[in-house]
Interface confidence: low
């Protein structure tokens, strides 16, 4: 009677890095012939593994393929990777010059499950302000099988994406996503987190995260006021320049004297808000009795190197 | 041509076990390459694969009715075999036996039999 | 386990229409699929396996499309005789899985 290969899987599940076993069994043991594991059909089928002295890395046979009486031919793949994914075919040859194929299998698929990388979010190159419409996108890749989700957060509330896409489009043996959101900054984000969450067959119910501070990404100029204090003294008058509510800490303060440099401040103790933002005081003491006209003081605040933020001040002459 | 044709009794008590066989004529059932399934109908509905096994050993279940069904063949007999443990009113269907080629589907059926779980 | 989702769950049409049956698995399952014709009483007939290839003895009207996730049965020229439920099957997974069937009636 005519030989039958039986493969009993039509197709298996296989997580990246582990091992799967891929059943073969024939029906008679003649004619007498080699059996070959194919992937693939055709001229372009590539040869997994051959019941001879032939060595192939990861990929063993289950049974004792050297017993006459053998009809196992099942092979164990070890160490499985995305390129590992397809149709694989037990097929039976009668021995000659050359052998000739005689029947093959009906094929086992495998399917490769693969995690996707952890997931990146980038941001734009410059910092943002508030009010302004910035793009964040968040790429993962190396995933199998296709089916993926991923969701946009920004401090818990989700976010719907610009657009998402999972490339290749056709059958591959992996996948890379690509999303992009947009989200409008406003002055309170300084503490605020945007996360990207990918949630795949392979990760258990526990998505990856990715997350984008956007601390990094926002720039809040701050509010600059010139204040003039009562006096301690007669001879003595008190300016303040406040600058209030600004991010990131990078402020330079200079104090100006009827448009001369009078002195410069390099802040270090900067006072933090709740809110992420920071603010300064700078005090500048004026010996009222040295100016017997009117003096125009200024306050020139360069922020995160924007352009100057100028305040001034008229202190009346004695 | 192959044909099927299930036996057993049409009535069966609850929680007792169902037994039915599947004759297998005009080929035989230890020639490989083929599925032997048994599939059911509960009434005016649609269609429940039970399980299928291969004449050298390997046998596949539906994992809902896996702890109570047994599958065998007795390939001297020409036969196949369902057991069916525990039933209850719920099993009441037509059951059908098949056999599955590897490219051709189910492409040989029994006539079905009727079997009321009732007491 | 694979769901297979059937539409319509029955329709009418007239004598020589095209009918069209749709099934929709719920994960990829490439063309493991089967259509089946069963008539009152009868046991099920297979039509078409693997997603397009129309079996043995089969009437050319009938024929099957699709591969992955969704897929058609399309009857060219409905014919009296072709009264009945047709369920597709998937056997890419266990356990293998029916559609809910579509009951085909004559107007």
């Known amino acids: 009677t005519e030989v039958k290969v039986i493969q009993p899987e039509k197709s298996v599940s296989v997580a990246a890095g582990d091992s799967t076993v891929l059943n073969c069994t024939l029906t008679s043991l003649l004619p007498v012939g080699p059996i070959r594991w194919y992937r693939g059909v055709g001229q372009s089928r590539q040869l997994i593994y051959s019941f001879t002295t032939e060595h192939f890395p990861r990929v063993t046979n289950v049974s004792d393929a050297t017993k006459r009486s053998n009809l196992d031919f099942s092979i164990r793949i070890s160490n499985v990777t995305p390129e590992d994914a397809g149709t694989y075919y037990c097929v039976k040859f009668q021995r000659g010059s050359p052998d000739t194929e005689i029947q093959s299998g009906g094929g086992t698929e495998v399917y490769v499950l693969a995690k996707p990388s952890p997931p990146e979010v980038s941001g734009p190159a410059d910092r943002g302000i508030p009010d302004q419409k910035v793009n964040f996108t968040c790429k993962s890749h190396g995933f199998s099988p296709r089916n993926i989700t991923l969701k946009w957060f920004k401090d818990g509330q989700e976010l719907h994406p610009l657009e998402t896409t999972v490339n290749p489009s056709g059958k591959n043996v992996s996948y890379n996503i690509s999303s992009t959101v947009r989200v409008v900054l406003n002055s309170m984000d300084v503490n605020s987190k945007v996360i990207c969450e990918v949630a795949h067959i392979t990760l258990d119910r526990s998505p990856l995260r990715g997350i984008a501070n956007l601390s990094n990404f926002i720039r809040v100029s701050p509010t600059v006021k010139v204040t003039q204090q009562s006096p301690t003294s007669m001879n003595q008058v008190n300016l303040t320049c406040r600058a209030e509510r600004f991010y990131p800490e990078d402020l330079q303060l200079i104090w100006l004297e009827n448009g001369n440099v009078s002195r410069n401040d390099t802040p270090k103790n900067l006072t933090k808000n709740t809110d992420g933002t920071y603010n300064y005081t700078s005090l500048f003491l004026v010996n009222s009795s040295a100016h017997r006209e009117d003096v125009v003081f200024t306050c020139q605040v360069k922020h995160d190197q924007q352009p100057a933020i100028t305040r001034n001040h008229t202190v009346l002459g004695f | 041509q192959v044909q099927l044709q299930e036996s057993g009794p049409g009535l069966v008590k609850p929680s007792q076990t169902l037994s039915l066989t599947c004759t297998v004529s005009g080929g035989s059932i230890s020639s490989g390459g083929y599925y032997w399934s048994w599939i059911r109908q509960h009434p005016g509905k649609g269609l429940e694969w039970i399980g299928a096994i291969y004449y050298s050993g390997p046998i596949y279940y539906n994992p809902s009715l896996k702890s109570r069904v047994t599958i065998s063949v007795d390939t001297s007999k020409n036969q196949f075999s369902l057991k069916l443990s525990s039933v209850t009113a719920a099993d009441t269907a037509v059951y059908y036996c098949?056999?599955?080629?590897?490219?051709?589907?189910?492409?040989?059926w029994g006539q079905g039999t009727t079997v009321t779980v009732s007491s | 386990d694979i769901q297979m989702t059937q539409s319509p769950s029955s329709l009418s049409a007239s004598v020589g229409d095209r009918v069209t049956i749709t099934c929709q698995a719920s994960?990829?399952?490439?063309?493991?699929l089967n259509w089946y014709q069963q008539k009152p009483g009868k046991a099920p007939k297979l039509l078409i396996y693997d997603a397009s290839n129309i079996e043995d003895g089969v009437p050319s009207r009938f024929s099957g499309s699709g591969s992955g996730t969704d897929f058609t049965f399309t009857i060219s020229s409905l014919q009296p005789e072709d009264i009945a439920t047709y369920y597709c099957q998937q056997f890419a997974y266990l356990p293998w899985t029916f559609g809910g069937g579509t009951k085909v009636e004559i107007k």
């Open positions: 098949s056999k599955e080629g590897y490219h051709s589907g189910m492409d040989v």
């Open positions: 994960d990829d399952i490439s063309d493991y």
